[in-house]
């Protein structure tokens, strides 16, 4: 057979479907890989073929578009399943040709069984939440294009195993779940599942997703450094270790990037000359709010480590702070006999 | 160790109403739901109704509809069963459980409540 | 409702035999079932669940087995303590039901 361009196997595009439900999947070439779209292609005379290869099988097949009720179906760019079996697992390749050209790519698709309480292989996607900041909504995912809008499907919301129902402060409405004021409590995995008729039959769609309830803009804060302080002084002997921690809160922003670094002598550690080492911790509360330690290690310090500036830095979304340690060489205690006795005369 | 421990034996006298309290020890009360199930003396096992303690969501079995009510007080930890108009095919010991938001199956239960309907 | 229909109502085995207990479901409950061990006087505990997955700090003589409508409880060496009223429960739909039990009794 003639050349053709190969995309190989996307696996940034791992399609994970729910065994006994519709699924409907868009030939990735369309989407990531061509410039231009179905409509064009097909007007410009290329057909679009799909072939795949089983779970564990080397050999690629057609697909079987001539199954009963029309299980598999082809719709423009679109593969429909009505609905999908385990077995429909494998890898799916759409090509797009005709006498003068070829392009193709594969995609894994994984059809997967769900238990009673939806819990499944499935990667969910992660819904957050401001806390206590008035109604918020999520909205049942990925659900168009699988029945008109004549249709008028049932929708059922399900928290964990549970029927979403008198909720002290969850209300579905449809295809939207609102959470009147969101708490820590409402965090947890939501399932909407979506009936409609069509041709006859009954299907299901069901989608899940995790809500986690994080830190409001309406709290947020700039960095806060809790250490160093003017409470602590690092008091240290040449030759003795020096452990400067940076402890950082900072409030949970959306999307924000949190930095923690530090200076000395006003100089990023990597551009000076002395034996520094530093490791960072990251911890998060419930709300994700989150605190960073830096800590600032000199194995064997010297008298001039001990006059530099230590200087520590936070910055996110919210502001830039900066707090200096307070580093000084300890006075040796004095030695009786020698320095007490000549300051008592002795000679 | 989690442990459920509920309320003493009760005898009642047909149409009154008897309620049954179930308390948690051992933490984690508010993140699972609490389950009834009774069984009549010989008999075999009947899913009467859950709450869910931190969201106030009850559920019921159709047969208990609107007999029961399942209420639950997280600053104790304990879970309540309250059957309404009693009567004697009630008789049966009355078990709570402990389910998981995500596991429906029943993994620490309490020792059991002899209820008694007798004239 | 599910219906759960199990057999038979009393088993007679003597200590050291296999015992298969049976679970028939009135509709497909995929692996949505959970097996309970009830002794005289004491609350049921759970052996199984998902159908065949042993319950923390459950023997291995303990097994389950099926999907769909038709279930297997094996207890392969019975012991003493084994003796007792063996449940099923579906909880694949809402009301959650359970079988009558089986009584596995010393013979």
């Known amino acids: 057979s003639e050349r053709c361009d190969d995309w190989g196997l996307d696996t940034m595009r791992q399609i994970q479907v729910f065994e006994d439900e519709p699924a409907r999947i868009k030939c990735p070439l369309f989407e990531h890989f061509l410039k231009f779209n179905y409509s064009t292609a097909h007007s410009a005379g290329l057909t679009l073929i799909w072939y795949w290869t089983r779970q564990d099988r080397d050999l690629e097949e057609p697909i079987n578009f001539r199954l009963p009720e029309n299980r598999i179906s082809k719709e423009k760019d679109v593969l429909w399943f009505r609905p999908t079996l385990l077995n429909d697992t494998g890898n799916y390749t759409c090509m797009l040709r005709n006498t003068t050209y070829c392009s193709k790519v594969a995609f894994p698709l994984e059809v997967v069984q769900k238990d009673s309480c939806f819990n499944s292989p499935m990667k969910l996607p992660v819904h957050k939440l401001y806390i206590e900041y008035g109604i918020q909504r999520i909205t049942c995912p990925n659900v168009d294009g699988y029945f008109p809008s004549s249709v008028k499907p049932t929708i059922t919301w399900y928290m964990g195993c549970y029927k979403i129902q008198n909720f002290n402060n969850v209300i579905p409405e449809g295809m939207n779940l609102s959470f009147l004021i969101a708490l820590i409590s409402n965090n947890g995995n939501y399932t909407c599942v979506v009936t409609y008729p069509e041709n006859g039959r009954t299907f299901h769609l069901t989608r899940t997703l995790t809500v986690k309830v994080v830190g409001s803009p309406k709290n947020a804060v700039p960095p806060v450094i809790h250490s160093p302080n003017d409470h602590v002084v690092y008091e240290k002997e040449p030759g003795e270790e020096l452990l400067i921690p940076c402890t950082v809160y900072f409030s949970f922003l959306m999307d924000s990037r949190n930095e923690v670094w530090w200076t000395i002598d006003g100089k990023k550690p990597d551009d000076i000359t002395i034996d520094v080492t530093i490791n960072e911790s990251i911890s998060h509360s419930r709300t994700e709010d989150e605190t960073r330690t830096q800590i600032l290690s000199i194995k064997k310090v010297t008298s001039e480590d001990l006059k530099r500036s230590y200087v520590c830095h936070a910055r996110s979304a919210k502001g830039e702070v900066a707090k200096a340690a307070k580093v000084k060489q300890k006075v040796p205690a004095p030695r009786y006999t020698v320095e007490l006795a000549c300051g008592f005369g002795a000679t | 160790q989690v442990q459920l421990v509920q309320s003493g034996a009760e005898v009642k006298k047909p149409g009154s109403s008897v309620k049954v309290s179930c308390k948690a020890s051992?933490?984690?009360?508010?993140?699972?739901?609490i389950h009834w199930v009774r069984q009549a003396p010989g008999q075999g096992l009947e899913w009467m109704g859950a709450?869910?303690?931190?969201?106030?969501?009850?559920y019921y079995a159709q047969k208990f509809q609107g007999r029961v009510t399942i209420t639950a007080d997280e600053s104790t930890s304990t879970a309540y069963m309250e059957l309404s108009s009693l009567r004697s095919e009630d008789t049966a010991v009355y078990y709570c459980?402990?389910?998981?938001?995500?596991?429906?199956?029943?993994?620490?239960w309490g020792q059991g409540t002899l209820v008694t309907v007798s004239s | 409702e599910i219906v759960m229909t199990q057999s038979p109502a009393t088993l007679s085995v003597s200590p050291g035999e296999r015992a298969t207990l049976s679970c028939r479901a009135s509709q497909s409950v995929s692996s949505n079932l959970a097996w309970y061990q009830q002794k005289p006087g004491q609350a049921p505990r759970l052996l199984i669940y998902g159908a065949s997955t042993r319950a923390t700090g459950i023997p291995a003589r303990f097994s389950g087995s099926g999907s769909g409508t038709e279930f297997t409880l094996t207890i392969s060496s019975l012991q003493s303590e084994d003796f007792a009223v063996y449940y099923c429960?579906?909880?694949?739909?809402?009301?959650?039901?359970f079988g009558q039990g089986t009584k596995v009794e010393i013979k």
């Open positions: 429960q579906q909880y694949n739909n809402w009301p959650w039901t």
């Open positions: 051992g933490g984690g009360f508010s993140e699972y739901a």
């Open positions: 709450i869910l303690p931190e969201q106030g969501a009850a």
């Open positions: 459980a402990r389910v998981g938001l995500y596991v429906p199956y029943m993994d620490i």
